[in-house]
Interface confidence: low
């Protein structure tokens, strides 16, 4: 329903704390270079204004849209052009074009230093001094580095952060309490970020219909006892929530997400028997819990899918009568029977089914033509199953670091033109799929592996879009989202690539590597590995292993030496020579 003042409505619905957090996230995601203090000042001004509108909805400017109010605030920032260049041109536009312009200038890879965690004592001191400011910094730092982070979920992670600090800062050994807990939150938040970015990509590139199909499949897997009308309603609501967040309408998004959680908890009887535990939690935890709730038990007496979608004499009539509804019910019926498939696979099967009906329903004898469609799904199902088996076997054999290296070699060969930092980041992320998914029960592996890989590859595509360098990557990124992962998997060595000439300085290391944390050491070694492959794209696994073992031995020896600098400067050139010989 229409409210006289949108900002007063949202302030009342969300409450001051969440309102301020969401406005801070919105500003940080739009203007990613501004400091926390600059944004905090704007947030306070917006909040004070919202309060005047709550007191009197007819007060000046209270009837303006949120985009107008927020956009005017952003455009009033001093030195906008100096700091943000052409983004300042957005301010010459009117709404809604101005907001669209801001969205287009969001940077998926801002040149900001990595978010460093202060040491435990310092962190606890500043948290105790001012918890609100401390959490504000957290929201600001995460939001500016992840401009599409799902805002209500970021509030949830901030709440987790807060709870961990409250607990651990009271302990004697703060460090050993904080580190594993905060590492866990960071890992989950990073996965959440790439998953949400994938949803926004789906929405931006292929529209609401594509996202809604994704939602129908996902919800049908989770709630196999809900009827199609219920699933459609949930998918429609979820699509609206995600559209708002992806579009920068964070207050509406958080408000609608809370409404959806409320609806689900009020209607458990027609949705799922597994919701009660989630529904007993407070708002942010409840919505988070519902988003990853375990699958309900599948109904025991589901008829074979073929009855309605292959054997029924009226398949073509039903399809012609209401294509989207018919295909929607196919996706629903197939997905609720297959919690063991990835959403990407389910969408590929629905696409195959649609293509089959398009072709067959135009023929003289449609049933004879579409009668084999379910059998034709087999290769589409086998391909990701084999991918999971092969990769999980490799992960179990090599461990996470070794598995990342194997992926790095594979992807550098597929797309050697891509920058080394991007390849290393992608390989490290892709390699984490082993730890994340390969330890799960058999029936959960495929959805975990493929949907996670798809989200990581979406990031590869976004980074590549900025500076396209590889025909291979462009080809895979231009197709539909669900075909991307199979496309990347099918890529082989890029035969058009002219190998990089060997530069000794690329493989020259200094004693400072010895004091780096393990993760940074790994990145240095992986950078060298990618450069080796770029130099010799057709090097065998054995050759690369020989060189990398030699390299590891060299680091180990020199980092243990009394005079590290001398060791690096004398042994380094010998290593380079041996590498060249091994790869010759």
């Amino acid at each position: 329903e229409a409210h006289k003042s949108e900002i007063a409505h949202r302030y009342n619905d969300l409450g001051e704390q969440h309102f301020k957090g969401l406005v801070l996230i919105a500003f940080s995601q739009y203007l990613q270079k501004c400091s926390y203090d600059e944004h905090a000042k704007l947030v306070q001004e917006v909040t004070d204004f919202a309060k005047t509108c709550v007191a009197d909805e007819s007060a000046a400017n209270c009837d303006k849209s949120l985009h107008t109010l927020f956009g005017d605030k952003l455009c009033a920032i001093p030195n906008l052009r100096e700091n943000y260049g052409e983004l300042a041109d957005c301010c010459t536009k009117q709404e809604p074009e101005r907001n669209e312009c801001f969205l287009q200038h969001k940077d998926d890879n801002p040149s900001l230093p990595p978010f460093e965690r202060p040491e435990a004592e310092a962190m606890c001191t500043s948290f105790k001094e001012n918890p609100t400011t401390f959490m504000g910094h957290y929201l600001h730092e995460v939001a500016r580095r992840h401009p599409y982070f799902y805002a209500p979920e970021l509030l949830y992670y901030a709440e987790q952060y807060n709870e961990i600090l409250t607990q651990c800062c009271a302990e004697a050994d703060k460090e050993s309490c904080l580190t594993p807990k905060l590492d866990g939150v960071k890992e989950k938040a990073l996965v959440s970020s790439v998953r949400q970015r994938m949803k926004c990509s789906s929405m931006q590139k292929f529209g609401e219909r594509a996202f809604k199909a994704w939602a129908v499949a996902r919800l049908s897997q989770t709630f196999p006892n809900a009827d199609f009308a219920e699933i459609t309603k949930l998918a429609t609501d979820l699509t609206k929530v995600n559209k708002e967040c992806c579009h920068g309408d964070l207050l509406e998004c958080a408000d609608d997400r809370a409404e959806l959680a409320k609806y689900m908890c009020e209607n458990q009887a027609t949705i799922s028997s597994k919701l009660q535990t989630c529904c007993d939690k407070p708002l942010l935890k409840k919505a988070h819990c519902l988003s990853e709730v375990e699958h309900d038990t599948m109904p025991a007496d589901l008829p074979a899918i073929a009855a309605d979608f292959v054997e029924d004499q009226e398949v073509c009539k039903n399809y012609a009568e209401a294509k989207d509804v018919f295909l929607g019910t196919f996706l629903y019926e197939y997905s609720r029977r297959h919690p063991d498939y990835s959403v990407s696979l389910l969408l590929r099967l629905a696409k195959k089914y649609e293509a089959t009906l398009e072709k067959c329903c135009a023929e003289a004898n449609p049933p004879a033509c579409y009668g084999t469609v379910l059998a034709e799904f087999q290769p589409l199902v086998e391909e990701p199953k084999n991918l999971v088996k092969t990769n999980c076997d490799l992960y179990e054999k090599l461990g996470e670091y070794g598995f990342q290296n194997a992926i790095l070699v594979r992807y550098t060969q597929k797309a050697p033109q891509v920058s080394t930092p991007t390849l290393v980041e992608a390989a490290r992320n892709l390699g984490r799929v082993g730890t994340k998914c390969c330890t799960l029960p058999e029936d959960q592996r495929l959805p975990c592996v493929e949907d996670y890989l798809s989200a990581i590859l979406n990031r590869v595509c976004l980074l590549h879009e900025k500076t396209p360098v590889s025909e291979h990557v462009t080809k895979c990124c231009s197709g539909s989202l669900v075909e991307r992962r199979p496309c990347f998997s099918a890529l082989t060595v890029d035969e058009t690539y002219v190998p990089k000439e060997f530069k000794a300085e690329t493989f020259t290391f200094h004693s400072d590597i010895c004091t780096l944390p393990e993760k940074e050491k790994q990145i240095k070694k992986q950078t060298a590995l990618a450069e080796l492959v770029k130099h010799k794209p057709k090097a065998t696994a054995e050759q690369l292993k020989t060189v990398m073992d030699d390299f590891a031995q060299f680091l180990d020896t020199c980092c243990k030496a009394a005079d590290k600098d001398t060791c690096f400067s004398t042994e380094g050139p010998n290593l380079v020579t041996r590498c060249k010989d091994a790869l010759a």
Partner: nanobody, 128 residues
């Protein structure tokens, strides 16, 4: 013959939510479109919402779109009407109705007319 029994109607405040249930007994529930209708004092009975026999398609009168939601539980032979953000003008006796399918597909939209079986009704009063 299908017997229908509505429940869940009561007095509520404006903007509250309410959920009506309609339990069906008798002939096979699955082969019926199910609808909700309402009649305000001194007015004609009007269509509110309907769901087709497989629960695959729904239809709503414009004034309730986005506020009311119809669903069915085939196993329990029950149809529900979830009513959110209620307004005083939603005050009426709400009737559940069923109509036998006649050759339309499981994807056909449910009808707004031609309902043969009716419940006794349940009173919903929304005070401002």
């Amino acid at each position: 013959q299908v017997q229908l029994q509505e429940s869940g109607g009561r007095l509520v405040q404006a903007e509250d939510s309410l959920r009506l249930s309609c339990a069906a007994s008798g002939r096979t529930f699955v082969s019926y479109d199910m609808g909700w209708f309402r009649q305000a004092p001194g007015k004609e009975r009007e269509f509110v919402a309907a769901i087709n026999w497989r629960g695959y398609t729904t239809d709503y009168v414009d004034s309730v779109k986005g506020r009311f939601f119809i669903s069915r539980d085939i196993a329990k032979s029950t149809v529900y009407l979830q009513m959110n953000n209620l307004k005083p003008e939603d005050t009426a006796v709400y009737y559940c109705a069923a109509r036998q399918m006649s050759g339309s597909s499981r994807y056909s939209p449910p009808g707004r007319v031609g309902y043969d079986f009716w419940g006794q009704g349940t009173q919903v009063t929304v005070s401002s």
